[in-house]
């Protein structure tokens, strides 16, 4: 069964900067990745980035840089311009559309006790079958 993992980390150098890492574990080829915050894509979440393996990446504020890390994982850097950091309590969701499996989505957030710069383990959130 395919799985999606999500990992959120705070940057050690800039406490207002966060990075979301997502990956797809399973067979098939990835056709699109969508990253949203505040909830799953299409269920109240706000799109932060769209990554297509051949057409390229797009991102919108507060996302700063979306990129492919490997053929099956991506990263999204976020910059919080506000005085307080809303990212700390926010859920980030990554949806991977793959062929022929369909769409798989998982969500994660920054662990409450995580130290800046330390990678949080993948959050064990149930994987949602989108289709």
């Amino acid at each position: 069964t395919p799985e999606v993992w999500v990992q959120v980390q705070m940057e050690a150098t800039e406490l207002s900067s966060f990075t979301v890492h997502c990956g797809f574990l399973g067979p098939g080829s990835i056709s699109l990745v969508t990253v949203s915050w505040g909830g799953p894509d299409g269920a109240g979440g706000t799109k932060l980035a769209v990554l297509h393996p051949e057409l390229g990446t797009r991102q919108w504020a507060p996302a700063r840089q979306a990129r492919w890390e490997t053929q099956s994982s991506i990263s999204l850097a976020l910059e919080d311009s506000g005085a307080s950091s809303p990212f700390a309590n926010t859920t980030f969701c990554c949806k991977f559309a793959s062929f022929p499996e369909g769409s798989w989505e998982s969500c994660g957030s920054l662990p409450p006790s995580s130290d800046p710069g330390l990678s949080a383990p993948p959050t064990p959130v149930p994987i949602l079958r989108a289709d």
Partner: antibody, heavy 114, light 113 residues
Framework: EVQLQQSGPELVKPGASVKISCKAS????????MNWVRQSHGKSLEWIGD????????NYNQKFKGKATLTVGKSSSTAYMELRSLTSEDSAVYYC???????WGTGTTVTVSS | DIVMTQSPSSLSVSAGEKVTMSCKSS????????????LAWYQQKPGQPPKLLIY???TRESGVPDRFTGSGSGTDFTLTISSVQAEDLAVYYC?????????FGGGTKLEIK
């Protein structure tokens, strides 16, 4: 069929502003982002910016910051671009293009002349 | 910003001939993470908006004839039309799809003799 229908030609005076529209049909408007591109007469293409209806925070080409403002009307499936402080240099055809520039609008000709 | 340079600026060929046009970028368009090149080619016929022909440097958009082929990697890319048809009269643009702001080349105008 995905279609982007743009508003008609505009003749505006220098210093004025203009707001052009791009009505999308044939797909779920909030699923895809929208680009705006300028093509001056006989010249190449310049990307102005993009906006996702689901996010609302546009990205701008630095060259067009302060010149263009991108917005969306989700209920009407329409994207808008306002151009201000127009000069003759802004006379061009302006296109909207959805997603990864895979579907383009019909184009709106803006002529700035006194 | 990534600067895209196309050559030649124009060329004139007879129907049935093979045509190649070049596009060079000022920075690499290769993503090291997934080893994909983010370059697209567009065709703009007179009085029409541009049409996406090729993305990912070499993948043809649905419905595009197989006489159009994209190749190249890094900073050097080529669009080849194996056997030019009269309806291929157009300006061809390459585009950086690697990083903001998205930038286009100056275009290559293809004329049919």
């Amino acid at each position: 069929e995905v279609q982007l229908q743009q508003s008609g030609p505009e003749l505006v005076k220098p210093g004025a502003s203009v707001k052009i529209s791009c009505k999308a049909s044939g797909y779920t408007f909030t699923d895809y982002f929208m680009n705006w591109v300028r093509q001056s007469h006989g010249k190449s293409l310049e990307w102005i910016g993009d906006i996702h209806p689901n996010n609302g925070s546009p990205n701008y080409n630095q060259k067009f910051k302060g010149k263009a403002t991108l917005t969306v009307g989700k209920s009407s499936s329409t994207a808008y671009m306002e151009l201000r402080s127009l000069t003759s240099e802004d006379s061009a055809v302006y296109y909207c293009a959805t997603g990864y520039f895979d579907v383009w609008g019909t184009g709106t000709t803006v002529t700035v002349s006194s | 910003d990534i600067v895209m340079t196309q050559s030649p600026s124009s060329l004139s060929v007879s129907a049935g001939e093979k045509v190649t046009m070049s596009c060079k970028s000022s920075q690499s368009l290769l993503n090291s993470g997934n080893q994909k090149n983010y370059l697209a080619w567009y065709q703009q016929k007179p009085g029409q908006p541009p049409k996406l022909l090729i993305y990912g440097a070499s993948t043809r958009e649905s419905g595009v004839p197989d006489r159009f082929t994209g190749s190249g990697s890094g900073t050097d890319f080529t669009l080849t039309i194996s056997s030019v048809q009269a309806e291929d009269l157009a300006v061809y643009y390459c585009q950086n799809d690697h990083s903001y702001p998205w930038t286009f080349g100056g275009g290559t105008k293809l004329e049919i003799k």
